[in-house]
């Protein structure tokens, strides 16, 4: 009685269960009643990452420097190359096919989370008592200067974009 289903890591062909090729190898010829499945290792710059019956290996991904990409992890016969972005850039998608510059946080906003090769800068508004007077992809909101600790008084209140202006005690307004 010919089988209708095969075990794990096998496939059904010509009413017969043949072994799948292991990751890193491609199928050359199906098994027969008398011979095992014939598999061959993938060539340089090729891979197959599953037990398979593919007759061709996949090409490793190319990390195109013109798109701001670089190799994060070199591919093997069983794994694809992983690309990431050059410094100052991050991927536009999960598959990281191209890169765009990290955004800067505008004045009045600080960096909540610094960008990585795969995620953009996350900005947050500076709350009262903090400020940012620069456009930056790295700077957090900074606290206003405490005039009191310098034996000075506030001459001009801070904003989310400017620090407090301190001055001598005697210049206190009446």
């Amino acid at each position: 009685e010919p089988p209708t289903a095969c075990r794990e890591k096998q496939y059904l062909i010509n009413s017969q269960c043949c072994s799948l090729c292991q990751p890193g190898q491609k199928l050359v010829s199906d098994c027969t009643e008398f011979t095992e499945t014939e598999c061959l290792p993938c060539g340089e710059s090729e891979f197959l990452d599953t037990w398979n019956r593919e007759t061709r290996c996949h090409q490793h991904k190319y990390c195109d420097p013109n798109l701001g990409l670089r190799v994060q992890q070199k591919g093997t016969s069983e794994t694809d190359t992983i690309c990431t972005c050059e410094e100052g850039l991050h991927c536009t998608s999960e598959s990281c096919e191209s890169c765009v510059p990290h955004r800067s946080c505008l004045p009045g906003f600080g960096v909540k989370q610094i960008a990585t090769g795969v995620s953009d800068t996350i900005c947050e508004p500076c709350p009262v008592g903090f400020f940012s007077n620069v456009s930056s992809a790295f700077e957090k909101c900074r606290p206003w200067t405490s005039c009191e600790t310098k034996d000075l008084v506030v001459q001009q209140a801070g904003t989310n974009k400017t620090d407090v202006v301190c001055g001598p005690q005697d210049r206190q307004r009446a």
């Epitope: 909540k112 500076c126 009262v128 206003w144 009191e148 008084v153 506030v154 209140a157």
Partner: antibody
């Protein structure tokens, strides 16, 4: 102890101005923000603006910009809120409250004046 | 401007009941640098000025009974009265102080059932 005492009730005609005072005691007036909040009859609280008396620095809610002026006199520890071009919708209780004290960590309003009722009616 | 939305607008409850009031901000009030939520809760009785109950979303103001508590982070906050007392029937307001202009929720009136 901290106290904020406001001026008495006022009845005003539409188009006129009102000036409400808030006399502070029990803390360093010049280094703490004074906030002004109003409440129309049966309505919620609405922030109008604030002043840091020592520097004269002010912040105003956009809604009142150009119609409200907040000032302070450090010699008498008194803050003032003047509202011009009054209309009937300005009928409300006006409160002053103490905000941050220069520590930059106490922006909430921990002490309030008793409120001043301003009635705008022709 | 940051909008503050309170719910419910009123609640009927009996003495001893647990009462929960919620407040939602239109943007996060949590600042990553100091991990503080810039939110306060006030109680107001008819004809009186508001009184500060809670600041930094969960810190109890000095002199306020411990049956009052605040919780939440980011955009969603709660004021809880664990066992309602006769003197707690009042209107409650949340307020953010993250950035100007400060804004208040529309208020929640706690009434006697």
């Amino acid at each position: 102890q901290v106290q904020l005492v406001q001026s008495g009730a006022e009845v005003k005609k539409p188009g006129s101005s009102v000036k409400v005072s808030c006399k502070a005691s029990g803390y360093t007036f010049s280094t703490s923000w004074i906030e002004w909040i109003r409440q129309a009859p049966g309505q919620g609280l609405e922030w109008m603006g604030s002043i840091l008396p020592g520097s004269g620095s002010t912040n105003y809610a956009q809604k009142f910009q150009g119609r409200v002026t907040i000032t302070a006199d450090t010699s008498t520890s008194t803050a003032y809120m003047e509202l011009s071009s009054l209309r009937s919708e300005d009928t409300a209780v006006y409160y002053c409250a103490r905000g941050d004290d220069g520590s930059y960590v106490r922006w909430y309003f921990d002490h309030w004046g008793q409120g001043t009722l301003v009635t705008v009616s022709s | 401007d940051i909008q503050m939305t309170q719910s419910p607008s009123s609640v009927s409850a009996s003495v001893g009941d647990r009462v929960t009031i919620t407040c939602r901000a239109s943007q996060s009030l949590l600042f990553s640098v100091n991990q503080k939520n810039y939110l306060a809760w006030y109680q107001q009785k008819p004809g009186k000025a508001p009184k500060l109950l809670i600041y930094w979303a969960s810190s109890l103001q000095s002199g306020v009974p411990s049956r009052f508590s605040g919780s939440g982070s980011g955009t969603d906050f709660t004021l809880t009265i664990s066992s309602l007392q006769p003197e707690d029937f009042a209107t409650y307001y949340c307020q953010h102080y993250y950035s100007y202009p400060w804004t208040f929720g529309q208020g929640t009136k706690v009434e006697i059932k």
